[in-house]
């Protein structure tokens, strides 16, 4: 058993049928010695008396808010949560496996640039009695500061019969140098509490590996005189790290016909302009990626050819 | 073809091309090593990210773009020096061009060159003959060092008579290649910045 925060305790249970559970001793936080009784949650049933209460915690019916009373007045509370260990592996009932970029990915994180700011998000089908808290640091043995904001419900989607909820959080490394070579990964730890179930999820990454630039901006087409060709130009997104000659992007450009089946001709360039043949009803698209480190491509920015 | 992009003319800055080759070679060699050593802890998540140049060179700090000099987090051990020399600086007049930066890159390359050669000598004694560095990566390092044209005392190649632990040597190779790829990215960024200056 360990203390999550004041008066909230997590009992770690080896979770299998007929498991013996864990013996827990609760102590009433009071100078009083006599006439103390204990109850669990809203039930008025007296579980025991005395300054301490010894319980065997085996299942969720044994978890909850234990209160010690004297003369009808509550003296102190202890909330017991359960953390299930199933065959050596902590349970992951609350969050959905996003399976990207690999199986067992519960937290996904992205950064738009090298400033040390990043966003993480996760999915669940649970809609009520759910709280999250997030901590983050650079490295774990001698952690350097990362400050995370409040967790927000960022999206709701219908998936078949189920509703899926996306939560996200923004974090900022306290003293980040965009040009630094990362040696220690960023660690993100999310505590999830659903009713009386406690779970924790972690993700470890280098900012360089989670970079996903915003799409290029100001995408423009300029027809060339006496030619079927068009000069297209675009700019680095505002959110990308500067100077751009140091934090350079590379671009993938394509012309997509009206039909999705039509062969797309893709080309790669480090420049911010190109000459293309842009037929009517087609569209021109461009996406960006760090020129020197192959992290994610941005989403496409598109304009119609006509 | 629907698309065409004009190819740039020859780079004004002679080291840019070499640094691009360096990054390609570093990335390819790392990728190949990860495939060959798939049963060894060789992924970014599994290795310790060591830096053999730590406390010996200060490439990131010495080569900071001017725009980032205002960022206090970037200035931990910044030593600024604006003396210019070395052949890559030919006829370029910008305050960013510091000998310290290019000298630091040169020293990095020299250190990695020695480490890679030492490691290769060990790996060539492995009866499994599982992996060794091809000449490409060593050649590319050499080319950039020549283009930088700094002179420095030669570092003797470490040689050991006792039989190496090949498992440890292969893991060390992974660590080295990951670190070298990261440093190659920095070098390429620096050269690109210098080229634009």
């Amino acid at each position: 058993i360990w203390e999550l925060k004041k008066d909230v305790y997590v009992v770690e249970l080896d979770w299998y049928p007929d498991a013996p559970g864990e013996m827990v001793v609760l102590t009433c936080d009071t100078p009083e010695e006599d006439g103390i009784t204990w109850t669990l949650d809203q039930s008025g049933e007296v579980l025991g008396s005395g300054k301490t209460l010894t319980i065997q915690v085996k299942e969720f019916g044994d978890a909850g808010q234990y209160t010690c009373h004297k003369g009808g007045e509550a003296l102190s509370h202890s909330l017991l949560l359960l953390h299930k260990k199933e065959d050596g592996i902590w349970s992951t009932d609350v969050l959905k496996d996003q399976k990207e970029p690999k199986n067992k990915t519960f937290l996904r994180c992205e950064a738009k640039n090298y400033s040390g700011r990043f966003t993480c998000w996760w999915l669940t089908t649970i809609s009520t009695d759910l709280t999250f808290s997030v901590k983050s640091s650079r490295g774990s043995s001698n952690p350097q500061g990362v400050t995370c904001g409040a967790v927000t419900l960022s999206a709701e989607r219908v998936r078949g019969d189920n509703k899926e909820y996306e939560y996200s959080v923004e974090c900022q490394e306290d003293s980040a140098c965009p040009a630094a070579e990362e040696r220690l990964p960023i660690e993100v730890m999310v505590d999830a509490i659903h009713k009386l179930k406690y779970e924790n999820y972690t993700s470890s990454f280098f900012i360089r590996d989670i970079i996903k630039p915003d799409p290029p901006k100001n995408l423009q087409l300029k027809p060339l005189k006496n030619s079927r060709q068009v000069e297209v130009s675009w700019e680095y997104p505002d959110t990308w790290s500067t100077p751009h000659s140091y934090f350079s992007l590379t671009f993938c450009i394509q012309v997509q016909g009206k039909s999705k089946r039509e062969k797309k001709d893709r080309i790669f360039t480090d420049k911010t302009s190109a000459t293309v043949i842009c037929r009517k009803n087609a569209s021109f698209s461009v996406q960006a990626q760090d020129r020197y480190y192959s992290s994610s491509w941005s989403e496409w920015a598109s304009v119609p050819c006509s | 073809r629907n698309l065409s992009v004009a190819t740039p003319g020859p780079e004004m800055f002679p080291c840019l091309h070499h640094s691009q080759n360096l990054l390609k070679a570093a990335s390819n060699t790392l990728q190949k090593a990860r495939q060959i050593l798939e049963f060894y802890p060789c992924t970014s998540e599994e290795i310790d990210h060591e830096d053999i140049t730590k406390d010996k060179t200060s490439t990131v700090e010495a080569c900071l773009p001017l725009e980032l000099i205002k960022n206090e987090s970037c200035l931990n051990s910044r030593e600024t020096s604006f003396i210019t020399n070395g052949s890559c600086l030919a006829s370029r007049k910008t305050s960013f061009m510091m000998a310290l930066c290019l000298r630091s890159i040169y020293e990095d390359l020299k250190m990695y060159q020695v480490e890679f050669k030492t490691m290769n000598a060990k790996l060539l004694r492995d009866p499994k003959r599982q992996i060794f560095l091809d000449q490409n990566i060593l050649g590319v390092i050499d080319e950039l060092m020549q283009a930088l044209n700094f002179n420095s005392e030669t570092v003797p190649q470490k040689s050991s008579l006792e039989e190496p632990d090949f498992y440890k040597t292969k893991i060390k190779l992974c660590i080295l290649l990951h670190a070298f790829r990261i440093r190659a990215v920095t070098i390429d960024r620096v050269m690109s910045y210098l080229n634009a200056s």
């Epitope: 049928p17 007929d18 009932d93 | 049963f39």
Partner: antibody, heavy 115, light 112 residues
Framework: QVQLVESGGGVVQPGRSLRLSCAAS????????MHWVRQAPGKGLEWVAF????????YYADSVKGRFTISRDNSKNTLYLQMNSLRAEDTAVYYC????????WGQGTMVTVSS | QSVLTQPPSVSGAPGQRVTISCSGS????????VKWYQQLPGTAPKLLIY???QRPSGVPDRFSGSKSGTSASLAITGLQAEDEADYYC????????????FGTGTKVTVLG
């Protein structure tokens, strides 16, 4: 004490279907994940499928994906395995088992797929 | 086919010590715990070892488990006639959990 009893096995022709049941008793069935494991005659153990305590997530071995469906009825304390498009290589003893460090196995039910 | 490799058979005289190895990789045994089962002919598997080296109550202390890196092993000391059975190791893969990974199985024969 914990008890698991499989039923529903038998002889079936290739391409046909069969539904296995596993009746659980002696524990809070709705709190624990459950597996199906099979063993072909003279061969080793092969995991088939898993279902979470609340039925929210199901996992399958590649060899049965798309043909077999694991399900549970927590009100009846019963685990099921619906087997469609059966093949000769599905011939085996099928066991249900609890998920956890100390697991409990049923006695097994024999499924024979033969023409 | 199984990704946890065991020797097909081991044998020993009564009273001897035999060991069965179970070889995996970094993503399974290297990052998860190992169980060992004993299966007597015509019966369901019986748990012998969990969490690499822990014995459930009722399992004789002649059976012991260990794990090192990407391999695990089961040792039976003071071999007895009733130990003649098939033995299986089991673990998980970090990317496919909760799928159970079983070893190929080892037949233990008690000589004489």
């Amino acid at each position: 004490q914990v008890q698991l009893v499989e039923s529903g096995g038998g002889v079936v022709q290739p391409g046909r279907s069969l539904r296995l049941s596993c009746a659980a008793s002696g524990f809070t069935f709705s709190s624990y994940g459950m597996h199906w494991v099979r063993q072909a005659p003279g061969k080793g153990l092969e995991w088939v499928a898993f279902i979470r305590y609340d039925g929210s997530n199901k996992y399958y071995a590649d060899s049965v994906k798309g043909r077999f469906t694991i399900s549970r009825d927590n009100s009846k304390n019963t685990l099921y395995l619906q087997m469609n498009s059966l093949r000769a290589e599905d011939t085996a003893v099928y066991y249900c088992k609890t998920h956890g460090s100390h697991d409990n196995w049923g006695q097994g039910t024999m499924v024979t797929v033969s023409s | 086919q199984s990704v946890l490799t065991q020797p097909p058979s081991v044998s020993g005289a009564p009273g001897q010590r035999v060991t069965i190895s179970c070889s995996g990789s970094r993503s399974n045994i290297g990052s998860n715990t190992v169980k060992w089962y004993q299966q007597l002919p015509g019966t369901a598997p019986k748990l012998l070892i969990y969490y690499n080296d822990q014995r459930p109550s009722g399992v004789p202390d002649r059976f012991s488990g260990s794990k090192s890196g990407t391999s695990a092993s089961l040792a039976i000391t003071g071999l007895q006639a009733e130990d003649e059975a098939d033995y299986y190791c089991q673990s998980y893969d970090r990317y496919t959990h909760p799928a159970l990974l079983f070893g190929t199985g080892t037949k233990v024969t008690v000589l004489g």
